[in-house]
């Protein structure tokens, strides 16, 4: 028998520095977690103690904090090189700055193979990107070889900016011939490493003949055997065992997100490359694990540029940006409009001639808007200003919801109106009229939404049975501020870009902004 240790991360999302327990900015260092300096310590400890170790990343290193905003992927290459990852799969967010924003900072600089079997380049891009990412890689591990085959969510064109010269094929269809190729090369130990979410990970384990282990990402799935060490609730045991169609027991793993855990899976193979046993658990990277001095010093060095960036002007406002709770928790506020407009702008994807865009709607809890921005400071808007407006380090995500769920959400928005509560929704691509004289749960008297399957966008009444795409904060997607109906009834949820980054990019693009209060939210009774 031959034993392999698989260390794995996924959806790190730019958390190079240690974070608080909820993966936001570290405040009390003695209680902080994760970060590459701490990850390095644990990885080196395991590499010293065990003979056959692979360190793998299942995608979405890009996007999530000011680190990515400033360094644009160079930080990912630098620190992943320092940690000597053995392989990485491309995630959807690796395409957030377009193909060039992937090629230059990461693909050309990485000292490890970057993989995806189901992304095919065409046209002029094919020769430019050739060899920079691979469908699979055979890695020597001790006296054996292990094949790693990569995959990426086929939804990436709707979630990021891969352009028109990359085709995202069905994962299973693309993986099978690559695995078959590895088998003909006498590689009998094969790991599928990819970024399509836990459901697809399980399908790959079930359907792709010859895959021994699946290491996934995208869905931020936390798996654990026994008592979990922090706040995350396990979605199943670690590893999650799938019985394949040809009768094999295939372990499937994922390690939550944000570098909070290091996935740790021990696999025992027989001489024919069959999995005999698999066991392990994610390792919580808490403060009991010291941060490595060399990596930490490098982090401190790179950090300086971030501090300088946060005070630079992104653009100007010529109007007061009203982000006060007195406005945003009671009525339409222009800060809410600005943020929602930025959220939609960030999701412009012309993937189908029938649609002017795949999504037109935004909702945003008023309680998530934490500060106004005064225009009387020469109109200057900085990252620091935006961090005061959006201090929670969230993301703006894409969900699919039925019209009936949206209706419930808007009823919840005003079910206890007048108490300055955070659930009052700011909107984009939506016209809503409330009648507060009616009883809670029946106050939405008009709800019109902007069409997507149209050449001239116009507002049509919401249809209860229709499925709509909506951009909203991850806080709402997870049922925050009492929006349990969104969490319970959403049909799809894909995590998006860092909230501040979305707004800052929009302001930089527009250069001068002047959002108005324009009748997106109305009240039909005389009291408003």
């Amino acid at each position: 028998a031959w034993e392999l240790t698989i260390l794995h991360t996924n959806d790190v999302h730019s958390r190079l520095e240690q974070t608080s327990e909820d993966s936001s900015k570290c405040v009390n260092a003695s209680r902080c977690m994760g970060g590459v300096a701490r990850l390095f310590t644990k990885v080196q400890q395991i590499r010293r103690a065990e003979p056959n170790v692979l360190l793998l990343d299942a995608g979405d290193q890009y996007q999530g904090t000011i680190w990515f905003t400033v360094y644009k992927g160079a930080e990912v290459a630098h620190f992943m090189n320092a940690l000597r990852y053995d392989a990485m799969a491309l995630g959807n967010h690796e395409f957030d700055n377009g193909v060039e924003g992937l090629i230059e900072p990461l693909l050309k600089e990485a000292k490890f193979p970057i993989l995806s079997a189901n992304i095919k380049a065409k046209g002029p891009l094919a020769s430019q990107i050739s060899g920079l990412y691979l469908p699979y890689k055979v890695l020597p591990v001790g006296d054996e070889v292990v094949g790693i085959v990569g995959y990426t969510s086929k939804e990436t064109p709707f979630l990021s900016n891969p352009g028109t010269n990359l085709v995202f094929e069905d994962e299973i269809t693309a993986l099978q011939p690559e695995v078959d190729k590895l088998k003909t090369l006498n590689v009998n130990k094969i790991i599928a490493l990819g970024h399509s979410g836990f459901e697809m990970d399980k399908l790959i384990a079930q359907k792709v003949r010859g895959v021994d282990v699946v290491v996934g990402g995208h869905s931020n799935t936390f798996l654990y055997t026994g008592n979990p060490p922090s706040k995350e609730v396990p979605a199943g045991k670690y590893p999650f065992i799938v019985t394949s169609d040809d009768g094999r027991k295939v372990p499937v793993v994922q390690a939550y997100a944000f570098g909070k855990y290091l996935g740790y899976l021990k696999i025992e193979f027989d001489e024919r490359g069959n999995v005999i046993s698999s066991h392990g658990n994610p390792i919580l990277l808490n403060s009991s694990i010291p941060e490595d001095p060399s990596i930490k010093a490098d982090i401190n060095k790179w950090r300086i540029k971030l501090d300088n960036y946060s005070t630079q002007e992104l653009g100007k406002t010529i109007v007061y940006l009203d982000g006060s709770s007195q406005s945003c928790r009671f009525r339409e506020c222009n800060m809410g409009n600005l943020i929602c407009d930025a959220m939609i702008n960030n999701n412009l994807r012309h993937t189908d001639e029938m649609f002017w865009n795949h999504v037109s709607m935004c909702i945003l809890n008023g309680g998530g808007i934490r500060s106004p921005i005064d225009e009387r400071n020469n109109g200057t808007i900085t990252w620091e200003n935006l961090a005061a407006v959006l201090p929670f380090g969230g993301t703006f995500d894409l969900v699919q919801l039925k019209g009936s769920t949206l209706k419930k959400a808007f009823e919840h928005s005003v079910h206890r109106y007048g108490q300055s509560t955070g659930e009052f929704l700011q909107v984009g691509g939506i016209h809503v009229v409330y009648d507060l004289s009616r009883k809670p749960g029946d106050r939405v008297v008009k709800l019109d939404v902007l069409c997507t399957k149209c050449r001239v966008p116009s507002y049509d009444p919401l249809k209860m049975d229709e499925v709509y795409k909506v951009i909203l904060p991850n806080f709402l997607a997870n049922g925050g501020d009492g929006f349990q109906m969104i969490k319970d009834e959403l049909l799809r949820h894909d995590s998006g870009d860092q909230d501040i980054n979305v707004v800052s990019t929009y302001i930089s693009k527009m250069k001068v902004i002047y959002p108005a209060v324009e009748g997106r939210i109305k009240f039909s009774t005389g009291s408003h």
Epitope: F40, Q44, R47, P51, V53, N81, A82, R84, D86, K111, V141, P293, S294, I295, K296, A297, D298, N300, K301
Partner: antibody, heavy 120, light 111 residues
């Protein structure tokens, strides 16, 4: 366990070249830099340079850039140092030592050293 | 290049007592919040062993009787209590910048 195996001794003539080896085992060879050091009884330890086995990227001390050439053979997990135009000044113990691929990282494992004697 | 001056050149210490070796750098080896001074033990016929890195962090498998301290330009290695197995040469080394440089060494003997 991590091991860096070096031959015990080499005897060569002045004016010739020599290629010293360092065979790594017990870890992923391409995952760490390989450094070479020189120790003469009168001059202490001197850093010659380093090589990244992943892509053979090298970095030399100014003092040794015309004296030493660092190479690797990935498939055998072996690092080499070639020393050219040898003189008695090159007689020394030469160590290979591993470090994580970041400038400030320490030399965490060492070979036993090869004693090079340059003599006619 | 950063020059490291180690003192004393030799030191005799009784079993169970404290041995202190000093290392002074010609310029600061501090770098973004850390001091990159390392300490090694060298015994005849054995590969050198990393004892302490970044001034005070213990190397893997190093006994607790070895400790390091200091910052900027002044550093020390402490061994307490001294054991027979500790008879060796000790070197300091800076890894703040290349070329990496070493102290001249301290020979630790038994009194």
């Amino acid at each position: 366990q991590v091991q860096l195996q070096q031959p015990g001794a080499e005897l060569v003539r002045p004016g010739t070249s020599v290629k010293l080896s360092c065979k790594a085992s017990g870890y992923t060879f391409t995952g760490y830099w390989m450094n070479w050091l020189k120790q003469r009884p009168d001059q202490g330890l001197e850093w010659i340079g380093r090589i990244d086995p992943y892509d053979s990227e090298t970095h030399y001390s100014q003092k040794f850039k015309d004296k030493a050439i660092l190479t690797v053979h990935k498939s055998s997990s072996t690092a080499y140092i070639q020393l050219n135009s040898l003189t008695s000044e090159d007689s020394a113990v030469y160590y290979c030592t591993r470090s994580s691929p970041i400038t400030t990282a320490p030399f965490d494992y060492w070979g036993r050293g090869t004693t090079l004697t340059v003599s006619s | 290049n950063i020059v490291l001056t180690q003192s004393p050149a030799s030191l005799a210490v009784s079993l169970g007592q404290r041995a202190t070796i000093s290392c002074r750098a010609s310029e600061s080896v501090d770098y973004y919040g850390f001091s990159f001074m390392n300490w090694f033990q060298l015994k005849p016929g054995q590969p050198p062993k990393l004892l302490i890195y970044a001034a005070s962090t213990q190397g893997s498998g190093v006994p607790a009787r070895f400790s390091g301290s200091g910052s900027g330009t002044d550093f020390s290695l402490n061994i307490h209590p001294m054991e027979e197995d500790d008879i060796a040469m000790y070197f300091c080394q800076q890894s703040k910048e290349v070329p990496y440089t070493f102290g001249g060494g301290t020979k630790l003997e038994l009194k």
